[in-house]
């Protein structure tokens, strides 16, 4: 008799999830000498322990603490790039500007990027059929709690000038409900962070508006200022040229506004 199982609204665990996490861990530790000491089988043990046999709407940050401990990593605190709704460009940027880091350039972010996972209460099975959706089912699901936990820690570690890449094509350039707006902004440490610099990425070729004047950016500025952190904003009118100029800063066309 097939056992009844909870049907959630979101997609199920990414297929071959354990193998993917393990393979990514091995690859990451091979590429990053400072993380060579990490035992990937222990990392997976800590990961599985965070969500397997637990109700997928009852996950806490505490559940991820063993994983956080194993994945502890020091990145240069003044080289942090946050992003909101523009992940691909942020990652393209740090692939070129190798001394800057997004969360997904750290071990834990790299392990989980683009993956979905959940378990079932009281069974040692992974649920490959469905997982809770943040809106339709519950917010304390394994994936959301993971990203909230690692994002908070990443923001807490930042210092000096912190950069954030924002998507100027969206109706809310700064969204208070995004991970950046709800977690990272509130966990920047004013005693360590001097300035938050926003890079607003334009989508249209002929878009010459100053998106730094957008009401949502003003809202971000207000939140940041109230936290005793300075705020600055730059328009990136041509993201393609921006990336090209990061690759080849000597190019003559890179002296004009990007």
């Amino acid at each position: 008799v097939p056992r009844w199982r909870q049907q959630w609204s979101g997609p199920g665990t990414t297929k071959r999830f354990p193998e993917t996490v393990l393979a990514r861990c091995v690859k990451y530790t091979e590429i990053h000498p400072e993380m060579r000491h990490v035992d990937c089988q222990s990392v997976w043990d800590a990961f599985k322990g965070a969500f397997i046999s637990k109700h997928p709407c009852n996950i806490t940050e505490e559940d991820y603490q063993p994983l956080m401990k194993l994945g502890t990593q020091t990145v240069p605190c003044n080289k942090i790039l946050l992003w909101s709704r523009i992940k691909d460009l942020a990652h393209q940027f740090t692939q070129v500007q190798r001394d800057m880091f997004t969360l997904e350039d750290t071990l834990l972010g790299y392990l989980a990027d683009d993956l979905t996972w959940c378990g079932e209460f009281n069974t040692s099975k992974i649920n490959y059929q469905s997982c809770p959706d943040w809106r339709k089912d519950c917010s304390n699901n394994p994936v959301s709690v993971f990203w909230k936990t690692v994002s908070r820690r990443f923001a807490e570690a930042a210092c000096d000038v912190v950069h954030v890449m924002l998507n100027g094509s969206r109706s809310k350039i700064f969204d208070k409900n995004s991970t950046f707006g709800s977690v990272e902004v509130h966990n920047l440490q004013p005693e360590k962070v001097q300035t938050l610099e926003a890079w607003v990425i334009h989508g249209g070729r002929e878009d010459s508006r100053d998106l730094c004047q957008d009401p949502t950016i003003k809202e971000l500025e207000s939140i940041i200022s109230k936290r005793n952190i300075q705020f600055s904003c730059k328009n990136i009118y041509r993201p393609d040229k921006f990336l090209q100029c990061v690759k080849n800063p000597e190019d003559s066309s890179c002296t004009s506004e990007i």
């Epitope: 089988q41 043990d45 599985k48 322990g49």
Partner: antibody, heavy 120, light 107 residues
Framework: QVQLVQSGAEVKKPGSSVKVSCKAS????????FSWVRQAPGQGLEWMGR????????NSAQKFQGRVTITADKSTSTAYMDLSSLRSEDTAVYYC?????????????WGQGTLVTVSS | DIQMTQSPSSLSASVGDRVTITCRAS??????LAWYQQKPEKAPKSLIY???SLQSGVPSRFSGSGSGTDFTLTISSLQPEDFATYYC?????????FGQGTKVEIK
């Protein structure tokens, strides 16, 4: 059905090395992990280490680090355990045991065991 | 390392008896616990995993319970073929560790 067949008994001198093999059949070799567990005469079970063939990576108990090498050959579906600098206390039956890569279950299949005797 | 402590180390019982073996972990291991049976000169055999799930093909007289640090293996009605040594093992973290074993002998 699944079978793990280990190599035969060995008699070794102190200071030498031993390499025990474990050939798997009846399952997809690369879908599993293989651990080595030893049992000294009249004693309990002691986990030594584990290899994941599809990744080619292994880990081991701190007690054995530097002395044990655990490997796997996907082409022959065989896991190996190499123990060096042998001493008399290493006299034991060595078992290979299989579990799933995700380590969500127990060691569900075991080899028949290989007796390694270390004696001068 | 997580220490696994079994009790008793040995017990004598008769066919038909209800037998209980306990296993305590030195720190919480959730339900990542397995029980094995080993007979002389044989490899161990898996009985229970995830603290309470019966391995396929294992008679229903075997059952497991517990979570966190305290676990129990129960044989509801001991059969002649059950006289053996039983081991618990945690697979919560590395290194994997076993209890020292409980020998079940004929009274």
């Amino acid at each position: 059905q699944v079978q793990l067949v280990q190599s035969g008994a060995e008699v070794k001198k102190p200071g030498s090395s031993v390499k025990v093999s474990c050939k798997a059949s009846g399952g997809t070799f690369s879908s599993y992990a293989f651990s080595w567990v030893r049992q000294a005469p009249g004693q309990g079970l002691e986990w030594m280490g584990r290899v994941i063939p599809f990744l080619g990576t292994a880990n081991s108990a701190q007690k054995f680090q530097g002395r044990v090498t655990i490997t796997a050959d996907k082409s022959t579906s065989t896991a190996y355990m190499d123990l060096s600098s042998l001493r008399s206390e290493d006299t034991a039956v060595y078992y290979c045991a299989r579990d799933d890569i995700a380590a969500l279950g127990p060691f569900d299949y075991w080899g028949q065991g290989t007796l390694v005797t270390v004696s001068s | 390392d997580i220490q696994m402590t079994q009790s008793p180390s040995s017990l004598s019982a008769s066919v038909g008896d209800r037998v209980t073996i306990t296993c305590r972990a030195s720190q919480g291991i959730s339900s990542w616990l397995a029980w094995y049976q080993q007979k002389p000169e044989k490899a161990p055999k898996s009985l229970i995993y995830a603290a309470s799930s019966l391995q396929s093909g294992v008679p229903s007289r075997f059952s497991g319970s517990g979570s966190g640090t305290d676990f129990t293996l129960t044989i509801s009605s001991l059969q002649p073929e059950d006289f053996a040594t039983y081991y618990c093992q945690q697979y919560n973290s590395y290194p994997r560790t076993f209890g020292q074993g409980t020998k079940v002998e004929i009274k």
